[in-house]
């Protein structure tokens, strides 16, 4: 029995420069782990692809806001 369970850490090393149209995005995850080299957002697209993006970019923040609104509207 191992003493502790090792949980893999997801980090972003490169981020996308260009906006992905909002119609293609499904969800996002914030990467804030201090063991990662940079703070990032991982967008999951409707095609199942995961793309790293920079939360300092306007389109990234706006897309997150937009997705938050969609999830709010889905709540009963």
């Amino acid at each position: 029995q191992p003493d502790s369970v090792s949980i893999p850490i997801t980090c972003c090393f490169n981020v996308i420069n260009r906006k992905i149209p909002i119609q293609r995005l499904e969800s996002y995850t914030r990467i804030t782990n201090i063991q990662c080299p940079k703070e990032a957002v991982i967008f999951k697209t409707k095609r199942g692809k995961e793309v790293c993006a920079d939360p300092k970019e306007r389109w990234v923040r706006d897309s997150m806001k937009h997705l938050d609104q969609i999830f709010q509207n889905l709540k009963p």
Epitope: K19, P21, I22, Q23, R24, K49, W59, D62
Partner: antibody, heavy 124, light 107 residues
Framework: QVQLVQSGAEVKKPGASVKVSCKVS????????MHWVRQAPGKGLEWMGG????????IYAQKFQGRVMMTEDTSTDTAFMDLSSLRSEDTAVYYC?????????????????WGQGTTVTVSS | DIQMTQSPSSLSASVGDRVTITCRAS??????LGWYQQKPGKAPKRLIY???SLQSGVPSRFSGSGSGTEFTLTISSLQPEDFATYYC?????????FGPGTKVDIK
């Protein structure tokens, strides 16, 4: 606001190549996804290809595969469309088109800003 | 490839008329559709994005509707500057495809 200015008209012989440029101002090219569309005289609009940010690569319409190359010079914010093995059917107006990143709808798919068009005539 | 068909291919109308143009996709494209207006010798201009959202600066007499495979562009009261050719564009699946166009001219 994003603006696109294209190179001037070209006259080419069959079998030759043409390179059309599209200069971006108001934004940097690396933040935009550029598309190319052509229109033959008296005909409709035809999408030739464009940059897919999701995959980080340029997608070409099957019809032009192997004959077209879309490239970028990020140092001058200029996009290029190179079409080779020209034939008379390639006589058309060629447009570049992209997003207007400063409008309320910028999160959506672009092609809402267009260049003025470049006329390419292929004739022997 | 997704085929886009438009009807009618041309129509004659008078100022003040209500005009409806239909675009059909050969398979579902969700709401990934735009409508463009083109005048002779000019670059296309987008009127509608995401099926029904009005591009900023475009008059409210233009509207779009539909989803899946059938889409409509409506001009509620045709103005002299609206005589042009109209195209739909699907950007759901590569290659992106335009409809063949609908020419609106003066009756």
């Amino acid at each position: 606001q994003v603006q696109l200015v294209q190179s001037g008209a070209e006259v080419k012989k069959p079998g030759a190549s043409v390179k059309v440029s599209c200069k971006v101002s108001g934004y940097t090219l690396t933040e935009l996804s550029m598309h190319w569309v052509r229109q033959a005289p008296g005909k409709g609009l035809e999408w030739m290809g464009g940059f897919d940010p999701e995959d980080g690569e340029t997608i070409y319409a099957q019809k032009f595969q192997g004959r077209v190359m879309m490239t970028e010079d990020t140092s001058t914010d200029t996009a290029f469309m190179d079409l080779s093995s020209l034939r008379s059917e390639d006589t058309a107006v060629y447009y570049c088109a992209t997003d207007d990143m400063l409008t309320p709808h910028y999160l959506y798919f672009g092609m809402d800003v267009w260049g003025q068009g470049t006329t390419v005539t292929v004739s022997s | 490839d997704i085929q886009m068909t438009q009807s009618p291919s041309s129509l004659s109308a008078s100022v003040g008329d209500r005009v409806t143009i239909t675009c059909r996709a050969s398979q579902g494209i969700r709401n990934d559709l735009g409508w463009y207006q083109q005048k002779p010798g000019k670059a296309p201009k987008r009127l509608i994005y995401a099926t029904s959202s009005l591009q900023s600066g475009v008059p409210s007499r233009f509207s779009g509707s539909g989803s899946g495979t059938e889409f409509t562009l409506t001009i509620s009261s045709l103005q002299p500057e609206d005589f042009a050719t109209y195209y739909c564009l699907q950007h759901n699946t590569y290659p992106f495809t335009f409809g063949p166009g609908t020419k609106v001219d003066i009756k």
